[in-house]
């Protein structure tokens, strides 16, 4: 039961995380205009990975896509790449993990196959989460660097009468969404890897060994049956060990509505 719960929870957490990574990647608010210690402007600037937007006091919002590829900063390209890799890996991970779920039966899939698939999806989720966290962190670092550079520029080179206000950008909502989503995907991946350990069959081979005792004849036969001693009323063979790593939660049961995520 614990393995199914761990696997299911890992899947759900990863699903939420990947949805968050996709949302963060698509969001326009990766960086937002810093309003602190800034002259009160009637326009609010914010930027995403794919376009920059301006919201006027009038309510009119204008967004312009970054139509150039070569003209964009290398760091922005790197962040885009990390986020896309994270999404792709996460999506593949989700696909794999669906088939790996214990509550979903596909033909006569071996437990070892499910364990391998669970491990694969877990690793994919971990890498996906790390990609997202790395991408968001690179962007955040870029913002911090630019923020202090623009702050320095604000207080220098103002010898002339006319002042130009430097627009400074700070962390946008997408960064926090990305960090949380990346973390969730990572946690989900770790949970899948933990679940995999519980799913993996323990390869234990019990060879047939015949012991000839001087008094009573006690034979241990392969196939999981304990032979009776030949004495007394206990003449039925009782199945006490099956040789496989089958746990109690693997007992056949009809799937409930909670089994499907």
């Amino acid at each position: 039961m614990a393995v199914t719960a761990c696997q299911g929870l890992g899947f759900v957490v990863s699903l939420i995380g990947i949805a968050g990574i996709i949302a963060a990647t698509c969001m326009d608010q990766w960086s937002t205009q810093d309003l602190y210690n800034n002259p009160v402007t009637a326009v609010f600037n914010y930027q995403g990975l794919w376009r920059s937007c301006v919201r006027e006091s009038s309510g009119f919002t204008e967004c312009r896509g970054y139509f150039t590829l070569l003209g964009l900063p290398a760091m922005l390209q790197a962040v885009r790449a990390l986020m896309i890799v994270g999404i792709v890996l996460g999506a593949i991970g989700l696909l794999v993990s669906i088939f790996a779920l214990k509550c979903i039966r596909i033909g006569s899939m071996e437990d070892s196959a499910k364990a391998n698939m669970t491990l694969t999806s877990g690793i994919m989720f971990i890498v996906s989460g790390l990609c997202a966290i790395a991408g968001v962190s690179v962007f955040a670092n870029m913002l911090v660097t630019n923020f202090w550079m623009s702050t320095a520029n604000m207080y220098t080179g103002m010898g002339g009468m006319v002042q130009t206000v430097q627009t400074r950008y700070t962390f946008g909502a997408a960064l926090f969404v990305g960090w949380v989503a990346g973390g969730l995907t990572l946690i989900g991946g770790v949970m899948m890897c933990i679940a995999c350990r519980g799913l993996a069959p323990e390869e234990t081979n019990y060879k047939a060994v015949s012991y000839h005792a001087s008094g009573h004849s006690v034979a241990y036969k392969p196939g999981g049956f304990k032979a009776s001693t030949g004495f007394g009323s206990n003449t039925k063979n009782k199945k006490i060990y099956d040789g496989g790593a089958r746990t109690e939660d693997e007992v056949q049961s009809y799937p409930s509505k909670h089994d499907y995520v």
């Epitope: 009160v40 402007t41 009637a42 326009v43 006027e56 006091s57 309510g59 206000v165 627009t167």
Partner: antibody, heavy 118, light 113 residues
């Protein structure tokens, strides 16, 4: 078409209060902020501030903080300018105007003349 | 507050003539986010409310004759009337729409001979 109709001229004594209305039609009232502009006789235009008709939040120019209050009533599609404790220098024509592209004042009311005389 | 300086204060021209008036702001009105200048031009005829002519420094409001043209960027802006008509007799105001408060210029009074 968009129209802003302001209340009629007002004759007030110093120290009194005046409330000017600006009724909007031809658009969704809460979609555009309402600005107020003062024009003293023979003088230029002076931006007083604006009210976000969706949130009710107001922004005032420094010269118009204190005695001046903007308000709006969505159901009546009307914005209001209230001036308390009227002074002689408040004698002017007051215009309401909606915010448009580029934060411009796109549509204007006909103006309300407020006369302050003892 | 942003100071908007308009010059000249008065302009007397003949019908059909080209006229240019200027507006200078104490700070740049260019927004780096969309590369637009938040400067607006209005026309106020005697006894009437102002009328929007140009926003974003150079975008003509619908219904405004194409003889009116706005130009400039940053701190220096110009309104040009390519061929003045008798009905253009008015005061022209520029306005900063980037920083609060939205200050107006003192106006340029255009008289047609």
């Amino acid at each position: 078409q968009i129209q802003l109709v302001q209340s009629g001229p007002e004759l007030k004594k110093p120290g009194e209060t005046v409330k000017i209305s600006c009724k909007a039609s031809g658009y969704t009232f809460t979609n555009y902020g309402m600005n107020w502009v003062k024009q003293a006789p023979g003088k230029g235009l002076k931006w007083m501030g604006w009210i976000n008709t969706y949130t009710g939040e107001s922004t005032y120019a420094d010269d118009f903080k204190g005695r001046f209050a903007f308000s709006s009533e969505t159901s009546a599609r009307t914005a209001y300018l209230q001036i308390n404790n009227l002074k002689n220098e408040d004698m002017a024509t007051y215009f309401c105007a909606t915010l448009g592209y580029g934060n411009s004042l796109a549509y204007w009311g006909q103006g309300t003349l407020v006369t302050v005389s003892s | 507050d942003i100071v908007m300086t308009q010059y000249p204060s008065f302009l007397t021209v003949t019908t059909g003539e080209k006229v240019t008036m200027s507006c200078k702001s104490s700070q740049s009105l260019l927004n780096s986010g969309n590369q637009r200048n938040y400067l607006t031009w209005y026309q106020q005829k005697p006894g009437q409310p102002p009328k929007l002519l140009i926003y974003w420094a150079s975008t003509r409001e619908s219904g405004v004759p194409d003889r009116f043209a706005g130009s400039g960027s940053g701190t220096d802006f110009t309104l040009t009337i390519s061929s003045v008509q008798a009905e253009d007799l008015a005061i022209y105001y520029c306005q900063n729409n980037y920083f609060y408060p939205f200050t107006f210029g003192s106006g340029t009074k255009l008289e047609v001979k």
